[in-house]
Amino acid sequence: DGPAGSWEQLIQERRSHEVNPAAHLTGANSSLTGSGGPLLWETQLGLAFLRGLSYHDGALVVTKAGYYYIYSKVQLGGVGCPLGLASTITHGLYKRTPRYPEELELLVSQQSPCGRATSSSRVWWDSSFLGGVVHLEAGEEVVVRVLDERLVRLRDGTRSYFGAFMV
Amino acid sequence: DGPAGSWEQLIQERRSHEVNPAAHLTGANSSLTGSGGPLLWETQLGLAFLRGLSYHDGALVVTKAGYYYIYSKVQLGGVGCPLGLASTITHGLYKRTPRYPEELELLVSQQSPCGRATSSSRVWWDSSFLGGVVHLEAGEEVVVRVLDERLVRLRDGTRSYFGAFMV
Amino acid sequence: DGPAGSWEQLIQERRSHEVNPAAHLTGANSSLTGSGGPLLWETQLGLAFLRGLSYHDGALVVTKAGYYYIYSKVQLGGVGCPLGLASTITHGLYKRTPRYPEELELLVSQQSPCGRATSSSRVWWDSSFLGGVVHLEAGEEVVVRVLDERLVRLRDGTRSYFGAFMV
């Protein structure tokens, strides 16, 4: 490449570095809807931000196609165990795409946290972290779901969160 | 700046992009001070390195402002459970900034790992992983704290660690 | 920008997008060999992909030297606890290099998940996540090992996976 080409390349590199899509959304009192929908998130206050990604009803919406490292952590807590077999918690990241009617599982964890209660304490705490690289097209969305979401413990946005960045 | 200045800036930016800030610090025998301070880390030996970030008394120090994916893992272990609710362990990443006198919580987990002891073995192991994107200004610092740090199990730098990279 | 500039920009964008190495490999029925070797992975179907990295017998193989964020999650599950201390599970990422005869531990976790069984359910689930930045030379390989791998629960590639990207 001649100098002009190098110049243009560098301009582009500068631009792409500045706008590398990234987001970190945080848990808030309104996160848990009880409606069977995905968790909702804070997008602006405190540690939350969106850069080159948008947000809609709990979903991170991709504006630029590419490979993204997506991640989520949820803080779980309870007192004793649900009676019966319902003590398994599923935490997952799911993709919504115009090409399919149903959400697609991307990254999922199952945990049985309430076995962490001890003889001297009924209270238990656990945390679930997910992260991985997925390809996302413009317009596709990623959401977080937790079943049973009643065991998600929100506080100040540092314990439950959801984010992504292009790699 | 004229074209020459811009050219130099871009050359520099390209170089700095090549040395995209990143670090991975590892647990060592000196990590646990018992002083109430943050964990300390190995910065050079083995898998540990600093590239475009510096280190001071347990803290990763930012030299270039931007969005960083910061992460930490700690290996926890013990024998049986302490009595009472003090069996909850808090593992967190905290920011120090010249603009505030107190550390700011960034990413935090609470776990109750000792409920993992079984009827046939009082020994338990657990691991806590945190990771997320935060904005950091030049001069700001990130530290790792674990309460109660006596339950952190160090060995060879692979089980407890702390790192970051610009996204 | 004139047409030439735009052309150069697109060339650059294409280049930079194509060559940042990244991969995400997913668990499959063939992942657990029982041979004492590392876990094997799906590289093409579903969510799995390789971009600027290659794969060989369970290993991600580096083609371009640099710092990589490597990660793995495994879904663990069982019924009750094995007797004795075999209830500890080790999940790790290991490096193979032509320079040493043995694998080198990079990132490792130990967990005691079966203590999560409860009074009303002997079934337990747990998840282990590892992620961190390591320097890898061209030709070096990274593998995932789980001891005891019989407790890894595969399903559809979303619960157990292995990936990397250059930072």
């Epitope: 009676l83 049973d148 | 609710l85 | -």
Partner: antibody, heavy 119, light 107 residues
């Protein structure tokens, strides 16, 4: 909606036995434990123990071991508290209260059953 | 057993006042504390759990704070219907225990 409906007031003599019922509705009975709480006249609340509605296993506080028994009729979504060999100090209002494992404490309470022990 | 010491035992207030009731635990109870309101002849009603989370339908003038051993229930802008007994309760360790109660009455 969620309701816990307790049986009516009881007037008993010392040495007799009383059995109080607590019928649950509006939720899956076997997914939540049931607590029993005593409140003597003009006094505070005292936890008696709880019963695991899934396994039927009772747990009693130290002061309520011996004469007190928790039981279930799962098909009728009903928990019972039986007090044997009644004493004057058993005079109180007894509440059943749902035990909520997601950390709400005792989130729903019965209206209480008054037991008076008098010769 | 974990003892919960509630204070004061009695509190006189006027409509519109702001009042605080404290509850001190003899051991660390994390945030596993609930607050109940009880009116004469009625069963206790859950106000707050996890020390600070309002139960469904509870007015936002009721707030809670604290963790570990020290907890506070605050009622801002007291209403006449708030006159009742208030109990703190720890549900983190067996045996479950209650504070002795605070009676909120009109001046």
């Amino acid at each position: 909606q969620i309701q816990l409906l307790q049986s009516g007031p009881e007037l008993e003599k010392p040495g007799e036995t009383v059995k109080i019922s607590c019928k649950a509705s509006g939720y899956t009975f076997t997914n939540y434990g049931m607590n029993w709480v005593k409140q003597a006249p003009g006094k505070g609340l005292k936890w008696m123990g709880w019963i695991n509605t899934y396994t039927g296993e009772p747990t009693y506080a130290d002061d309520f071991k011996g004469r007190f028994a928790f039981s279930l009729e799962t098909s009728a979504s009903t928990a019972y508290l039986q007090i044997n060999n009644l004493k004057n100090e058993d005079t109180a209002t007894y509440f059943c209260a749902r035990d909520n494992w997601d950390g709400k404490g005792m989130d729903y309470w019965g209206q209480g059953t008054s037991v008076t022990v008098s010769s | 057993d974990i003892v919960l010491t509630q204070s004061p035992k009695f509190m006189s207030t006027s409509v519109g006042d702001r009042v605080s009731i404290t509850c001190k635990a003899s051991q660390d109870v994390d945030t596993a504390v609930a607050w109940y309101q009880q009116k004469p002849g009625h069963s206790p009603k859950l106000l707050l759990y996890w020390a600070s989370t309002r139960h469904t339908g509870v007015p936002d003038r009721f707030t809670g704070s604290g963790s570990g051993t020290d907890f506070t229930l605050t009622i801002s802008n007291v209403q006449s219907e708030d006159l009742a007994d208030y109990f703190c309760h720890q549900y983190g360790s067996y045996p479950l225990t209650f504070g002795a109660g605070t009676k909120l009455e009109l001046k």
